[in-house]
């Protein structure tokens, strides 16, 4: 494979949220195209995104086969169109990515509050379980299925009339909290993997949801479901 006029990719970067995983790189191609290969440490190199003029490649299908494996990718550069033929048979230039372990490194997507319901002085807040592209026995798994008890949610809640926040934690997708009678509350949740010690330990906060807004009043004896 001749390599005339081709430059190796650089700045290979993994972008991954809830296991949706894209490899990005530079430069924008001029008279060249790319093919990406991905491998586990012990596995073989599998080509993806053949002869692409893009500078990104969706590798989700490969990494979801085993999210606890460590993956390495490499990007090959090939000349596109007419180039001066040197008769060279050297290997095409390529660049390796950093290693990537999806289970440890995928970012946690912004969670969503699925519903809340009040009964007396208790409110049950339910976090929507996000689906991932990870499969088991031909069934897509949720974020909770994949992470199990490694994943917790932190609930931030406060009276609509004040700014003092309280917090609660759960290793399921539900919170049951005590509230003051006759008060409206606002809620926001955050996904957290406490065992991680890196910047991707926490998700961004969910959108804020408040009792008594838009969808009707939440009565002490009634139910208020907030669906998205």
């Amino acid at each position: 494979s001749g390599t005339t006029n081709t430059v190796a990719a650089y700045n290979l970067t993994w972008k991954s949220t809830n296991f949706k995983t894209i490899l990005e790189w530079e430069p924008k191609p001029i008279n060249q195209v790319y093919t990406v290969q991905i491998s586990t440490k012990s596995g073989d190199w599998k080509s993806k995104c053949f002869y692409t003029a893009d500078t990104e490649c969706d590798l989700t299908d490969e990494i979801v086969k085993d999210v606890k494996q460590t993956y390495l990718a490499r990007v090959f550069s090939y000349p596109a169109g007419h180039v001066e033929s040197t008769g060279s048979t050297e290997e095409p230039p390529y660049e390796n990515s950093p290693e990537f372990t999806p289970y440890l490194e995928t970012n946690l997507g912004q969670p969503t509050i699925q519903s809340f319901e009040q009964v007396g002085t208790k409110v049950n807040v339910t976090v929507q379980d996000e689906w991932t592209l990870v499969r088991r026995n031909d069934t897509f798994l949720s974020l909770r299925d994949v992470f199990g008890k490694d994943l917790i949610y932190t609930l931030y809640y406060w009276k609509s009339s004040s700014s003092g926040k309280k917090t609660a934690k759960t290793n399921t997708n539900e919170f049951l909290i005590d509230v003051d009678k006759g008060e409206n509350y606002c809620f926001s949740v955050q996904a957290v993997i406490p065992s991680r010690r890196t910047a991707n330990r926490k998700s961004t906060d969910s959108p804020v949801e408040c009792m008594g807004h838009e969808k009707g009043e939440s009565r002490e004896t009634g139910h208020h479901h907030h669906h998205h």
């Epitope: 073989d44 599998k46 080509s47 053949f50 169109g81």
Partner: antibody
């Protein structure tokens, strides 16, 4: 139905050029790569290169670099393969072949009927 | 370039026989291998893609498997219409390359 129809047989002198066409129908032309594969008489198959019809980007096998040009005309859903500086060993059947879906991007799932190019003085 | 060594180059078998063709890659190509059937005077036809997936409309007597860099193509019960030359093709590395072909004849 999905099909690729190629231009007719050609006889060329050494040093000349030949341009073979391949008209696609029955599918969205821009969505599938097109490849060219040749087969010398009694011999095996040899991949020459690929063209992405949506952007016109081409990649050629090193063996053919500088002699082959692949182009496309999106208005007629046609791809072309031009081979220059012909020599006797270029005598072969030339096939266009569609690259498969994303599932099998570099499997050739639809083939043209082939164009016989004879190079003879 | 990746060399695809196909064997045997030809074989003769009876109708109903199990026929096996092998293709060995000169280096690891993952499962990026396809199998084609070419009848005399005709264009090749895709039978198997990604080493073991049967192309739509292809009879189930055709199958493919992989063990490391060795790939096997099998016709479980040879039929008269299976007389053809069979080719493997790898696409894991540029340029794409084919095996030399196996000509299958009926005894």
């Amino acid at each position: 139905q999905v099909q690729l129809v190629q231009s007719g047989a050609e006889v060329k002198k050494p040093g000349a050029s030949v341009k073979v066409s391949c008209k696609a129908s029955g599918y969205t032309f821009a969505n599938y790569y097109m490849h060219w594969v040749r087969q010398a008489p009694g011999q095996g198959l040899e991949w020459m290169g690929i063209i992405n019809p949506s952007g016109g980007i081409t990649v050629y096998a090193q063996k053919f670099q500088g002699r082959v040009t692949m182009t496309r005309d999106t208005s007629t859903s046609t791809v072309y393969m031009e081979l220059s500086s012909l020599r006797s060993e270029d005598t072969a059947v030339y096939y266009c072949a569609r690259g498969g879906s994303k599932v099998a991007a570099l499997a050739f799932d639809i083939w043209g009927q082939g164009t016989m190019v004879t190079v003879s003085s | 370039d990746i060399q695809m060594t196909q064997s045997p180059s030809s074989l003769s078998a009876s109708v109903g026989d199990r026929v096996t063709i092998t293709c060995q890659a000169s280096q690891d190509i993952s499962n990026s291998l396809n199998w084609y059937q070419q009848k005399p005077g005709k264009a090749p036809k895709l039978l198997i893609y990604d080493a073991s997936n049967l192309e739509t409309g292809v009879p189930s007597r055709f199958s493919g498997s992989r063990s490391g860099t060795d790939f096997t193509f099998t016709i479980s019960s040879l039929q008269p219409e299976d007389i053809a030359t069979y080719y493997c093709q790898q696409y894991n590395f540029h340029p794409l390359t084919f095996g030399g072909g196996t000509k299958v004849e009926i005894k």
